[in-house]
């Protein structure tokens, strides 16, 4: 959804054997919008594979056609394969649906990597492991694509969960979640727990595994520990937030905070990496290199091109620093920080040559379109997209991969002044120049 490396997403086993699950903490929290507590029917409704995307099962049409759909908070179109494609096991057959309505309009969506086009219509849509409702939603029937579908990913479409402003062909095309909230009593909120496996998964493991949960209309306490901390949604287009400080192993990067949000910072489940603006990326890599200097890594590793491998079970997690992003809080001059481990930003990949080794790619990369908090960030946390109150909540995920020495963390409050100055104001340009990222 955002430009840059947007391999649609990665996921893995919930409570991966290589990582420890944190115990639940009990805590009292203020009343939240939406239903709270247990959403048993929606827990574990996501699956996926490292670097290829988290997907949920959906049904479209009458009689229902079942498809796996990538969950993408960085775009706003609901689009499904609607023609044969070498990488699709199945696709939406509009002619078989008695409830399909043609909108008589074409649509084209370019991502940074990958593009698709298709024809707009509406049909009845439901989520079997979601709320027990059926809605009439806009659907883009993808008829042509390039580098969009991924061989072996097991998903056939994309569910853009961001706002109408970035919908294609224009903001008059109501996104799925807006339709859902308008047509039902589902509260205007959803939450995501993306569970990284901590190790690569083969095809059969992916199909058998849990990749996480998308809780539609509420918050499930079993999916996180500690407290939820909220940051304002700066503008309702992407899920835009403001980063006010960045630390590597507790050391402040000491940059003008505008740089962290140049030209925006977004939370995007459809992007694999943590993507950082050029200057920030360079400073962060310099700091991470320095912190991990007991081992030397090739330049290609830091560019995300080369893997590094260690003998199975010997990955030196301790030499890699933790990364903390401070986000604007809900209270004036108050911020909180989210901290990820190398277990999040080193992405496990299969090395065909040495399958007995544990191999990783560096999953922090450079961006020309701002900060993208992709799976690398989200796999550490339970993330609440509280649209009703225009805020995003973060809590430590009950399924994040960690070790016996360190865990991901969400901590606050911290005093931070002039946080509004950290936001970058994008010059108003022709909306047609807007790119949807997917890397």
């Amino acid at each position: 959804t955002q430009h840059g490396i947007r391999l649609p997403l990665r996921s893995g086993l919930g409570g991966a054997p290589l990582g420890l699950r944190l115990p639940r903490e009990t805590d009292e929290e203020p009343e939240e919008p939406g239903r709270r507590g247990s959403f048993v029917e929606m827990v574990d409704n996501l699956r996926g594979k490292s670097g290829q995307g988290y997907y949920v099962e959906m049904t479209v049409g009458s009689p229902p056609q079942t498809l796996n759909i990538l969950v993408d908070t960085g775009s706003s179109n609901f689009a499904v394969g609607a023609a044969p494609h070498p990488f699709l096991h199945r696709y939406y057959q509009r002619q078989l649906s008695s409830t399909y309505r043609d909108l008589r309009k074409g649509v084209y969506v370019p991502y940074t990597q990958g593009k698709w086009e298709g024809e707009l219509g509406t049909d009845l849509v439901s989520i079997p492991h979601g709320p027990n409702v059926t809605v009439r939603a806009n659907i883009a029937a993808i008829t042509e694509s390039d580098k969009f579908f991924i061989n072996g990913s097991n998903w056939e479409g994309i569910l853009g969960l961001a706002y109408a402003e970035i919908a294609r062909p224009d903001d008059s095309l109501e996104p799925f979640f807006d339709s859902l909230v308008k047509q039902t009593h589902v509260p205007n909120l959803f939450s995501l727990q993306l569970c990284g496996a901590g190790f690569p998964l083969n095809q059969s493991e992916v199909l058998a595994s849990v990749g996480g949960s998308m809780i539609i209309g509420g918050i499930d306490h079993s999916l996180y520990t500690g407290s939820l901390w909220y940051t304002p949604i700066r503008r309702e287009w992407y899920y835009e937030v403001i980063i006010v400080r960045v630390e590597i192993n507790g050391q402040d990067l000491k940059m003008d905070c505008k740089e962290y949000n140049y030209d925006k910072s977004i939370v995007d489940s459809g992007t694999t990496n943590l993507r950082l603006p050029k200057k920030v990326f360079e400073a962060a890599v310099k700091s991470i290199k320095a912190a991990s200097s007991t081992e030397k890594f090739p330049d290609g590793f830091w560019l995300g091109e080369q893997l590094v491998c260690w003998q199975a079970g010997t990955t030196p997690w301790n030499i890699f620093p933790v990364i903390s992003l401070y986000l604007m809080g809900e209270v004036t001059n108050q911020s909180f920080r989210i901290t990820i481990l190398p277990q999040q930003y080193l992405r496990p990949v299969e090395d065909v040559a040495t399958s007995q080794d544990d191999c990783y790619k560096f999953a922090i990369s450079q961006s020309s379109t701002g900060t993208v908090m992709g799976a690398v960030i989200m796999e550490g946390f339970y993330v609440v997209f509280d649209r009703a109150r225009k805020r995003i909540g973060f809590a430590v995920s009950a399924c994040h991969v960690h070790d016996e020495f360190r865990t991901a963390a969400v901590e606050g409050p911290f005093v931070t002044l002039d946080m509004e100055d950290c936001g970058y104001n994008i010059p108003q340009t022709d909306e047609s120049t807007l790119m949807t990222g997917r890397a």
Partner: antibody, heavy 124, light 107 residues
Amino acid sequence: EVQLLESGGGLVQPGGSLRLSCAASGFTFSTYAMGWVRQAPGKGLEWVSATSGSGGSTYYADSVKGRFTISRDNSKNTLYLQMNSLRAEDTAVYYCAKGGSQWLYAPGSWFDPWGQGTLVTVSS
Amino acid sequence: EIVLTQSPATLSLSPGERATLSCRASQSVSSYLAWYQQKPGQAPRLLIYDASNRATGIPARFSGSGSGTDFTLTISSLEPEDFAVYYCVQRSNFPWTFGGGTKVEIK
């Protein structure tokens, strides 16, 4: 230089069939959308059909849907329009046109240049 | 179906004069509109695409403006070779439709 050469036009009786061809040269044919536009004698222009670079996306005017079929052979750099159940109102000069990209619905992907056209006359 | 209404049907002007051609859509087409020029016995050629972008090789005297339902093609100073028929066309909705054309003739 881009060249588009239409052929296959002629006189046909109502209810008959005709297959138009458009031989393309001067560009990588498979990476561009292609289309057909017609112009009845002394009248304005009407879109007939179009197809994306790989043929995945296709467009038909309501007036020809179910009767005309657009296709392309990327190995032969040729675009086709199979016209069945022809009617008097299908009488026109049929132009072949090159899209601006492989995409049919992308902004900026408009059709230019056009061939010189081939005349189809449907009459008894 | 989106109807494109071009006005005037005929525009009689002298070389060097400014020509302003209008195209009105029956509903919004956003910026998915283009202008083509057609001379007698020739195929149409693209002048302006996406409402305001000049196609490759088109002289700067041609400009397009507008979005939504009202569009204008302006020829700042008519050259002898500009006397022709001009069509607007939309690709926002199916069916793609052309306007009826404006003939720019020598006064």
